[in-house]
Interface confidence: low
């Protein structure tokens, strides 16, 4: 007998399938598997060459050698031979192609009377009207249940006509279905038209919640409606907990704003805080082969009815892919203030600020900046000096963001745009950052706080002081003084004590002259080298009634050092029992060079000093 | 301003138990979720409890249901987290968290949860 020529044969998809006639396998017998090649679903399918006496038992082939075979060939095997390929095929559990399983399905033209030697799939392809017995229909329809009906598209006219066959074949009348109906149908369940879902739907939610593929629009609002209604097995969304949210999953997309909206808030936040960072939770994508760059390709599009038309909570539903696809950029820069009332993941916001990005390449203008919320945490500082900041409405709005927290280097660049903007340190402007953060004036460089102008002074508040060194007070002092000038005593002294680390010996004397009853919290902040001049009875005047606490202090600066300076029995007139003073009969002469560079007498600073008894006796004196 | 100030925090032997109190001041009412989260050293923050506003319903991840409980006086303000078998992994800073927008929005300073032998 002579052997046919060999040629190369496509299988479904378009992929090279076997190189040799398969069919000479399955109807002569003729030949051997040698070589393999990789078949399209990352099986391995075998090309056969050799020749055999004797035809061959199909079920002895291994699934390898079972693979990829092309449908123009299993057009000329007999019924009895194409029944024994797709028993060996759901034996060996080999996994076909749609065109393989269509072309199959048509060479079995009698109905099959072993459904359960069939592969599960194949049955998918089978015309239903085949098996119109009540027993016949009933043993079709449970194999059916088990298969993969995804296999086919939704549209596709052997999908379609198996859900009203199913349906007649279960009894099922009008649209009321049970759970053994609904379990009954299987796959066919992710078909049910809205009806079934509006008077079904305690049975029918949770099904459809695993419905691999989107639901239709009908599907949709039907499902959302009942939802809605707050009917079993849900109950009303303003109960759901994390468990509801778990349950629901698979209809997330489908709950519009008024759902979303009624659902305990906390309960949205923790169920999106532990899905963000729980990958175990997330459903799987269904694999499917195809090369990469088809996939991203395929991802740029928007699904069908996925568009998003404006920016609500309905979004935070999306798959990150999704937004990029759906979401236009100018669309979310004009509805920006709604970004921080939804509960995006962190990656969903890193979407959102690569469509700004992309939308904005030199810088956010102000409208978009003022209402990006926790997007601002997203930015970086290279980010933000593109930015221009005018408003302080803007600054308030993303300081808010940033509360509670230390100053980032976002922040940090952020006040650092605003302020060189605005070309000086304002009251309105120091006013709002000390509010946010008490410590930043005591953050800004003597230099930098020599551009505050005295009118914003009157912004400062005590706490805002609380870390500022000597050498910023130096500064701040002087602005202070200038800005209270026109305050009478007791009121003067209220807002300037705060900044009396940097005052003069000159100040502090004046002030001692005006019963101000400095505390000794203040007192303890003034500078020693202002203190120190000081007489006894300067220091009683200064402090009032608080004169009593030098004592819990006399060990500490700037106490100490002024203590060194006083003679002993003036100390001794407060009562105090302060020790440590000059006694009488002793000359303090103080030989620094900073004392005749400065003329401030500096007991305890660099230099020599010379103490020298003398004898002040009257006697030698005449 | 919101202010959440938690309290109740410190050393505990393994198996021991904790409660920790969160007081609530500022422009809040009862109407806002609120929850605790921990930090251990080097890890993210991962919430450990969340309560809603005028219901029972309440939020716990598997790693501390059953020993957890959450619950609110929102007559004082107030938000408790009881801590029953602690374990050496409960170790962590605590915070108390206030809802803002779908979101644990406003946090608390902490307080160092330590269970340890």
């Known amino acids: 007998m002579a052997l046919p020529t060999a040629r190369p044969l496509l299988g479904s998809c378009g992929t090279p399938a076997l190189g040799s006639l398969l069919f000479l396998l399955f109807s002569l017998g003729w030949v051997q598997p040698s070589r393999t090649l990789a078949g399209e679903t990352g099986q391995e399918a075998a090309p056969l060459d050799g020749v055999l006496a004797n035809p061959p038992n199909i079920s002895s082939l291994s699934p390898r050698q079972l693979l990829g075979f092309p449908c123009a060939e299993v057009s000329g095997l007999s019924t009895e031979r194409v029944r024994e390929l797709a028993v060996a095929l759901a034996q060996k559990n080999v996994k076909l192609s749609t065109e393989q399983l269509r072309c199959l399905a048509h060479r079995l033209s009698e109905p099959p009377e072993d459904l359960d030697a069939l592969p599960l799939d194949l049955l998918l392809f089978l015309n239903p009207d085949a098996f119109s017995g009540p027993q016949a229909c009933t043993r079709f329809f449970s194999r059916i249940t088990k298969a993969n009906v995804d296999l086919l598209p939704r549209g596709a006219p052997e999908r379609q006509r198996l859900l009203p066959a199913a349906l007649a074949c279960w009894g099922v009348r009008g649209s009321l279905l049970s759970e053994a109906d609904v379990r009954a149908l299987g796959g066919l369940a992710c078909d049910l038209p809205g009806r079934f879902v509006a008077e079904s739907a305690e049975v029918l939610l949770p099904r459809l919640v695993s419905c691999p593929g989107p639901l239709d629009q009908d599907q949709q609002e039907a499902a959302r409606a009942a939802l809605q209604g707050g009917g079993p097995p849900y109950g009303p969304p303003s109960t759901w907990s994390v468990s509801t949210m778990d349950a629901l999953r698979g209809l997330l997309p489908v709950l519009g704003q008024p759902i979303i909206r009624s659902i305990p808030q906390g309960i949205v936040a923790a169920w999106r805080q532990r899905s963000s960072r729980d990958p175990s939770w997330r459903q799987p994508e269904r694999t499917i082969l195809r090369p990469r760059f088809r996939r991203e390709v395929e991802k740029t599009a928007c699904p069908s009815g996925k568009k998003a038309r404006e920016i609500d909570e309905s979004l935070i539903f999306y798959k990150k892919w999704e937004l990029e696809a759906c979401v236009d950029a100018a669309l979310l820069a004009t509805q920006m203030d709604r970004v921080n009332a939804i509960p995006f993941t962190y990656e969903q916001l890193d979407v959102l600020k690569h469509k700004l990005d992309e939308l904005y390449p030199q810088g956010y203008p102000e409208s978009v900046i003022q209402h990006l919320g926790y997007l601002f945490l997203k930015m970086s500082p290279e980010d933000i000096r593109k930015w221009n900041v005018t408003s302080l409405e803007t600054l308030k709005a993303l300081l808010e963001v940033n509360k509670g927290h230390e100053m980032s280097p976002q922040v940090a660049t952020l006040i650092d745009r605003f302020v060189k903007g605005r070309g000086q340190l304002d009251k309105d402007t120091l006013d709002t950052l000390t509010a946010f953060y008490p410590g930043y004036l005591c953050s800004l460089s003597p230099e930098e706080l020599s551009s505050v102008p005295p009118s914003s002074i009157w912004a400062v508040r005590p706490q805002d002081l609380d870390t500022c060194d000597p050498r910023q007070l130096d500064v701040l002092y002087p602005k202070a003084r200038l800005a209270f000038q026109n305050m009478n005593g007791s009121e003067y002294f209220v807002k300037i004590q705060s900044f009396l680390g940097g005052a003069p010996t000159e100040d502090l004397k004046a002030l001692s002259q005006q019963n101000v009853s400095m505390d000794l919290a203040t007192f303890m902040k003034l500078r020693t080298d202002a203190v120190l001049p000081l007489t006894v009875a300067e220091v009683q005047k200064l402090l009032g009634p608080h004169v009593e606490g030098l004592k819990a202090e006399e060990r500490h600066r700037p106490v100490r050092d002024w203590i060194l300076r006083q003679r002993q029995d003036d100390l001794d007139t407060l009562g105090l029992g302060l020790q440590g003073g000059i006694p009488n009969g002793y000359l303090v002469l103080d030989l620094s060079m900073q004392e005749a560079l400065s003329g401030t007498p500096c007991l305890l600073g660099p230099g020599p000093v010379l103490t020298v008894l003398a004898l002040l006796l009257a006697s030698t004196l005449a | 301003e919101v202010q959440l100030v938690e309290s109740g925090g410190g050393l505990v032997q393994p198996g021991g138990s904790l409660r920790l109190s969160c007081a609530a001041s500022g422009s809040t009412s009862g109407i806002y979720a609120m929850g605790w989260f921990r930090q251990a050293p080097g890890k993210g923050r991962e919430l450990v409890a969340a309560i809603n506003s005028f219901s029972d319903i309440t939020y716990y991840p598997d790693s501390v249901e059953g020993r957890f409980t959450i619950s609110r006086d929102n007559a004082k303000r107030m938000v408790y987290l009881q801590m029953n078998s602690l374990r050496a992994e409960d170790t962590a800073v605590y915070y108390c968290?206030?809802?803002?927008?779908?979101?644990?929005?406003?946090w608390g300073q902490g307080t160092q949860v330590t269970v340890s032998s």
């Open positions: 968290v206030r809802e803002r927008g779908y979101n644990f929005g406003y």
